[in-house]
Interface confidence: low
């Protein structure tokens, strides 16, 4: 009973929840649940019954494969979906799919926290601002990635003349999307444009 599959999809997309193996032959009943006890749809005696739920009108069952099609998924659809199959023998078998729905990340805004000449070098502190999202950050200087230590929302670095980059890019990403924001400097150490 340890079948658990993880799926991550972008909000607004159409999703197919299915299992990677064949259904048991001549099963008696197939039911999809949202969480552990909320029925979405049940197939029994060559007929599908759709239950009153937030999915009504958004789901379709393919009894041949057991696949459940959900249209226009939203973050509120995040859950573990369970497909339970009742075999002719009377035994039950279940499969679980953990669905994570993520919004596309918004375009980040780079905020210049601090920029100053220091010991003939350029001290730079930039923050990459996006509204309350759990994302990964990657910073680039003239399209070259900064080392991994710098991969959070704030870039703090001291640039020597041989290390100057003109433009700094913050790339925010989650597992379904990615967006960039860029700020450019005029050597040695002044803001040029966004």
């Amino acid at each position: 009973q340890g079948h658990l599959v993880h799926m991550t999809v972008v909000s607004g997309s159409n999703v197919t929840l299915n299992i990677s193996e064949s259904l048991p032959e001549n099963y008696k009943q197939l039911t999809w649940f949202y969480t552990f006890d909320q029925k979405i749809v049940e197939w029994d005696s060559r007929k599908s019954k759709y239950f009153e739920s937030k999915f009504k009108g958004r789901v379709r069952l393919d009894p041949q494969s057991g696949a459940l099609y959900i249209s226009k998924v939203q973050k509120e659809d995040n859950s573990t979906y369970i497909m339970r199959v009742l075999k002719k023998t009377g035994n039950e078998q279940e499969w679980k799919i953990k669905l994570q729905v993520l919004d596309p990340v918004p375009k980040p805004v780079i905020k210049i926290e601090k920029i100053e000449d220091m010991d003939d070098n350029c001290y730079l502190k930039l923050s990459c601002v996006i509204p309350g999202e759990s994302v990964n950050y990657t910073w680039y200087g003239d399209k070259r990635p900064f080392p991994k230590e710098l991969q959070n929302s704030v870039l703090e670095t001291t640039l020597m003349p041989h290390n100057y980059s003109r433009c700094y890019t913050c790339q925010v990403s989650n597992s379904v999307s990615s967006k960039n924001g860029t700020v450019c400097l005029s050597p040695p150490c002044t803001l040029a444009r966004s």
Epitope: Y123, K125, E149, E156
Partner: antibody
Framework: EVQLLESGGGLVHPGGSLRLSCAAS????????MSWVRQAPGKGLEWVSL????????YYADSVKGRFTIFRDNSKNTLYLQMISLRAEDSAVYYC???????????WGQGTLVTVSS | EIVLTQSPGTLSLSPGERVTLSCRAS???????LAWYQQKPGQAPRLLIY???SRATGIPDRFSGSGSGTDFTLTISRLEPEDFAMYYC?????????FGQGTKVEIK
């Protein structure tokens, strides 16, 4: 001229604690990330910890995570490494080093020896 | 983490000879983020090369670095007496920062 001077090393029993200091001069200390790197006797170099210029971000090698704390006092131009639950394998010369653009280490202090032994 | 393997472990040479030290990475080092350090007994390491091939300030031009990806080389064109020391490579393209185990260049 950039100078880094470590202190605070010594002999400590397993399970004990020690605090290392690194006094910096010759540059605007608060503008640079700093790091600790160690070298066990007769062995190679191992990166230990990093702190950003403002002190807001810290990073640790897995081997010291949860036992070592890096911090800095920019008003005193001093970097620190607080070490607890010391083990024999922590015995090493500990160097503080200025991070150049979060890339390589340049320059390094002369090092301070930490010996963990019963 | 990226493992750096230096070879040979020890080199026994005479002043005036040309030296080639190798540093091989277990995976590609991004943007040639590789540095070389020299360390003499009882002293701290000193930066020689950064970015695989750029000489640090004050480093004589007999020291040169080359390579990219997984294979890097430090060359000393003509050994001077003060060059007998340990040499370490270090990658700074991915976390954690890692060093090679070192190559000892000793007088024959």
């Amino acid at each position: 001229e950039v100078q880094l001077l470590e202190s605070g090393g010594g002999l400590v029993h397993p399970g004990g604690s020690l605090r290392l200091s690194c006094a910096a001069s010759g540059f605007t200390f608060g503008g640079y990330a700093m790091s600790w790197v160690r070298q066990a006797p007769g062995k190679g170099l191992e990166w230990v910890s990093l702190i950003s210029g403002s002190g807001g971000s810290t990073y640790y090698a897995d081997s010291v995570k949860g036992r070592f704390t890096i911090f800095r006092d920019n008003s005193k131009n001093t970097l620190y490494l607080q070490m607890i639950s010391l083990r024999a394998e922590d015995s090493a010369v500990y160097y503080c080093a200025k991070y150049s653009n979060y890339d390589y280490f340049d320059p390094w202090g002369q090092g301070t020896l930490v010996t963990v032994s019963s | 983490e990226i493992v750096l393997t230096q070879s040979p472990g020890t080199l026994s040479l005479s002043p005036g000879e040309r030296v080639t030290l190798s540093c091989r990475a277990s995976q590609s080092v991004s943007s040639s983020y590789l540095a070389w350090y020299q360390q003499k007994p009882g002293q701290a390491p000193r930066l020689l090369i950064y970015g695989a091939s750029s000489r640090a300030t004050g480093i004589p031009d007999r020291f040169s670095g080359s390579g990219s990806g997984t294979d890097f080389t430090l060359t000393i064109s003509r050994l001077e007496p003060e060059d007998f020391a340990m040499y370490y490579c270090q990658q700074y393209g991915s976390s954690p920062r890692t060093f090679g185990q070192g190559t000892k260049v000793e007088i024959k």
